[in-house]
């Protein structure tokens, strides 16, 4: 169950989609990454609130556990929901290869 | 790639599957739900320290990124990987029902 | 619309050379990375080259590495494939084709025959 | 490089039939599959990416699953202009490369 979408802390308080400008050395690829030299990486950024986007059945009980025991239990955890393709040109033993990556880009964010 | 299981933070500091007892009324589901009792809720909770137990790509993304710049990227994050079915014996509007639900119960964790 | 026109069709002999053209519209050329595709007369497709938008990154299936060399001209518009010592297998119907950036072909040309005989 | 195994070769359809062929990649793709058909004369078009989504205006009747190395096509009640080649291409990684094809043709 994807619950609410209104955030109570404000706009933009709550977990959503963000966008990190990071270049090949920011993320430790310089040495087997040729390109994009820089990449825009989409991740999940923000609180999770009771019942914000709730990603399932265990993010409900999460909450519940929290507000209970908030300093032996979590809050729910901003994380991907699903991911967009990236293709990496990168370095290989033999030269050169395009490689399709399925987990570099967050397309869309829940709580968990 | 779920990478290094050893925590450099010391035994049982880092992400790993943990036990919580919950109540009915603990969960908010008195009105709803009859049985069990009581729910031996698995949750995954603890630090994700660098490469500890890294979903993926993105895990080891933001990492970087948070190592980089932590007040705008948040470190990785312990949240299930996988999850345990637990049936409940629920009341419905004609008397009650046995619903099997897939993801109450983490399984095991890692760091996302 | 999106339209690329493959040119250069032709019969070569065996060692022979032949360069192929591709005229792309309706979409911003620069920005998309190309590859050509062949069907051969067995009606099986093959992967032949693939160029980044600028030019700077090119792979080729190793049945025509060294003998073919993919170009692009941004201002122009175009694509090329230069085909050189030319074999009888690489026979086929050649088709254009733009890459949105996941290695998958959404758009195709209509294709060039290309026919290597003695 | 990744082999695509294609099969069968030949499907033969009546029209309202539900159909699938597979395609098995010789190492782990994810779910980088690619499905087109193409039609005599015709340039091959693309239907499916993501070994599931369904390209702009393919009609649902088409749909793709599978990930790893196991992939299905299927249509679900096929129509006369239907009948065509199907290849399924993995972009995973270069080479890319394709399934030998699947001809569907009328009983």
């Known amino acids: 169950a994807r619950n609410g979408d209104h955030c109570p802390l404000g706009p933009g308080r709550c977990c959503r989609l963000h966008t990190v400008r990071a270049s090949l050395e920011d993320l430790g690829w310089a040495d087997w990454v040729l390109s994009p030299r820089e990449v825009q990486v989409t991740m999940c950024i923000g609180a999770c609130p009771s019942q914000f986007r709730a990603a399932n059945m265990h993010a409900q009980i999460k909450t519940s556990l929290h507000r209970l025991k908030p300093d032996t239990v979590p809050a729910p955890c901003c994380v991907p929901a699903s991911y967009n393709p990236m293709v990496l040109i990168q370095k290989t033993d033999t030269g050169v290869s395009l490689q399709t990556y399925d987990d570099l880009l967050a397309k869309d964010c829940h709580c968990i | 790639a779920r990478n290094g299981d050893h925590c450099p933070l010391g035994p049982g500091r880092c992400c790993r599957l943990h036990t919580v007892r919950a109540s009915l009324e603990d969960l908010g589901w008195a009105d709803w739900v009859l049985s069990p009792r009581e729910v031996q809720v698995t949750m995954c909770i603890g630090a994700c320290p660098s490469q500890f137990r890294a979903a993926n790509m993105h895990a080891q993304i933001k990492t970087s990124l948070h190592r980089l710049k932590p007040d705008t990227v948040p470190a990785p994050c312990c949240v299930p990987a996988s999850y345990n079915p637990m049936v409940l014996i629920q009341k419905t509007d004609t008397g009650v029902s046995l619903q099997t639900y897939d993801d109450l119960l983490a399984k095991d964790c890692h760091c996302i | 619309d999106v339209k690329l026109v493959e040119s250069g069709e032709g019969l070569v002999k065996p060692g022979g050379s032949l360069k192929l053209s591709c005229a792309a519209s309706?979409?911003?050329?620069?920005?998309?990375?190309m590859s050509w595709v062949r069907q051969t007369p067995e009606k099986r497709l093959e992967w032949v080259a693939y160029i980044t938008s600028g030019g700077d990154y090119i792979f080729y299936a190793d049945t025509v590495k060294g003998r073919f060399t993919i170009s692009r001209d941004n201002a122009r518009n175009t694509l090329y494939l230069q085909m050189s010592s030319l074999k009888s297998e690489d026979t086929a119907m050649y088709y254009c084709t733009r890459d949105d950036g996941y290695l998958w072909f959404a758009y195709w040309g209509q294709g060039t025959l290309v026919t290597v005989s003695a | 490089s990744i082999v695509m195994t294609q099969t069968p070769k030949f499907l033969p359809v009546s029209a309202g039939d539900r159909v699938t062929m597979t395609c098995k990649a010789s190492?782990?793709?994810?779910?980088?599959v690619a499905w087109y058909q193409q039609k005599p004369g015709q340039s091959p078009k693309l239907l499916i990416y993501?070994?599931?989504n369904r390209y702009t205006g393919v009609p649902d009747r088409f749909t793709g699953s599978g990930s790893g190395t196991d992939f299905t096509f299927t249509i679900s009640s096929v129509q006369v202009e239907d009948l065509a080649v199907y290849f399924c291409q993995q972009h995973y990684s270069s080479p890319l490369t394709f399934g030998a094809g699947t001809k569907l043709e009328l009983k």
């Open positions: 190492q782990n793709v994810g779910n980088n």
């Open positions: 993501y070994a599931s």
């Open positions: 309706g979409f911003t050329f620069s920005s998309f990375a």
